[in-house]
């Protein structure tokens, strides 16, 4: 049977087993999510994309999954990130009272995975999936992350932090998930301030990256939404990573 060849990598191998195993592990670790039925979660996840054209996925397709994965995180402890996922995740692993999207059930389930199906067949496509640029934006993975990212940003309150990669040419990228989704879904009636942490490449880089034109662009977007903006240069990824390796060290109690 002829199969559409997409430009992106195919579904992650053992995708169903991985999602199910992650769900079980997450609900074991997080008592507040123990009520979640992981088989139902997988069924809802599968139902969002199986038998559907992988360029015609909508946010509505994911609503059953969103409902099952409803989770309350402290709205004033949210950490967003852009192009610096590993460091953000390492941070919340040590700084346990802050949360990235991938620290929530739905984010945890899908982190680093790819998936898609085929129109009118119950098969999962392990050969190829649509690439966001080359094929289509309404693909299963992109729509999933757009949906959960929007909900995550909408839940945020008080001071929201975002970790940005100061080593990239565009420190703030309007086309990133943070720039295209999360920034526009922070609720001005709930969020007082967005504080950007610009992570420098090393201790020797003494520039003020908060002056970067893309950061000024972010400040403009946020200010127009009646949310205050602040930015801090963070010069110590070396020290930071030392604490990730040795989180029990008494010197690794973050003071923010």
């Amino acid at each position: 049977r002829w199969r559409q060849q997409w430009s992106g990598p195919g579904t992650t191998k053992r995708f169903p087993e991985t999602v199910l195993a992650r769900c079980v592990k997450y609900t074991e670790i997080h008592p507040e999510m123990r009520h979640v039925d992981c088989q139902s979660v997988w069924d809802a996840f599968k139902g969002a994309f199986i038998s559907k054209h992988p360029c015609n996925i909508t946010e509505e397709d994911y609503q059953p999954l969103m409902k099952l994965g409803t989770q309350t995180v402290p709205c004033n402890k949210i950490l967003l990130w852009s192009r610096i996922k590993d460091l953000a995740h390492q941070f919340t692993q040590v700084q346990r009272d802050m949360f990235t999207l991938e620290d929530t059930l739905l984010g945890y389930l899908a982190d680093d995975l790819t998936w898609c199906g085929e129109f009118n067949t119950s098969k999962i496509n392990y050969q190829s999936c649509p690439d966001w640029r080359k094929d289509c934006s309404n693909n299963p993975v992109s729509v999933f992350w757009k949906t959960v990212s929007r909900r995550f940003a909408e839940a945020a309150c008080d001071v929201v932090h975002v970790m940005l990669n100061g080593s990239r040419s565009k420190i703030f990228d309007k086309n990133s998930t943070f720039g295209s989704v999360e920034v526009h879904n922070l609720q001005p009636e709930k969020v007082q301030t967005l504080e950007a942490w610009v992570i420098h490449g090393g201790r020797e880089d003494s520039r003020d990256l908060c002056q970067d034109p893309t950061i000024k662009e972010l400040e403009s977007i946020i200010s127009k939404r009646n949310i205050q903006f602040s930015c801090k240069n963070i010069y110590r990824p070396d020290k930071f990573l030392q604490c990730v390796k040795n989180p029990e060290d008494s010197s690794c109690t973050s003071e923010i």
């Epitope: 941070f91 003020d208 908060c210 930015c231 801090k232 110590r236 020290k239 930071f240 604490c243 010197s251």
Partner: antibody
Amino acid sequence: QVQLVESGGGLVQPGGSLRLSCAASGFTFSSYAMNWVRQAPGKGLEWVSGISSWGSSTYYADSVKGRFTISRDNSKNTLYLQMNSLRAEDTAVYYCAREDGSYMTDYFAYWGQGTLVTVSS
Amino acid sequence: DIELTQPPSVSVAPGQTARISCSGDNIGHYYVSWYQQKPGQAPVLVIYSDSNRPSGIPERFSGSNSGNTATLTISGTQAEDEADYYCQSYNGTYVFGGGTKLTVLG
């Protein structure tokens, strides 16, 4: 409780050398980056040098680069500052300080009482 | 490196509010700490990360930082608060302000 005790200060001639020590107790020394900060008589504070928790990275103010060497012995809970080619402008009280604020910010939560270094002929 | 500028001296009557400024180009983009130093003694950390107070520091000490100025505020100043105060920041190297002598009048 945290204690930092400096020693090794004294009077030295210009061009001479001196080695300062800082004995640490009351905390896990090997977990913390450590620093030397100095204060000339009647003047403000000036950061001199810093060293990472395991000694793999060292940092110096431009004013002492090439002349001073910071080191540590974690088995002895001791921080050192080897000062060579001393100048009159190095005259100061030298404080040993523990670096805190591991992730996003850096500051000195604990200081020793200081040791006076006088460079004069 | 960033340069931090403090007024050499500030005077305040007991019970009044003392404000000590620390100015620097876009200092709000950097975390600022404050130290108190009494004559013949080592510095003591009174504020870190712009506005956080270490345990044991009285509530009358507070800090703020935005734009080009960081401020240490001492409300209900007491005679024992008379000391030199230094701001400090970090941009790949540690930088201190020149210090401010706080005099409590009377």
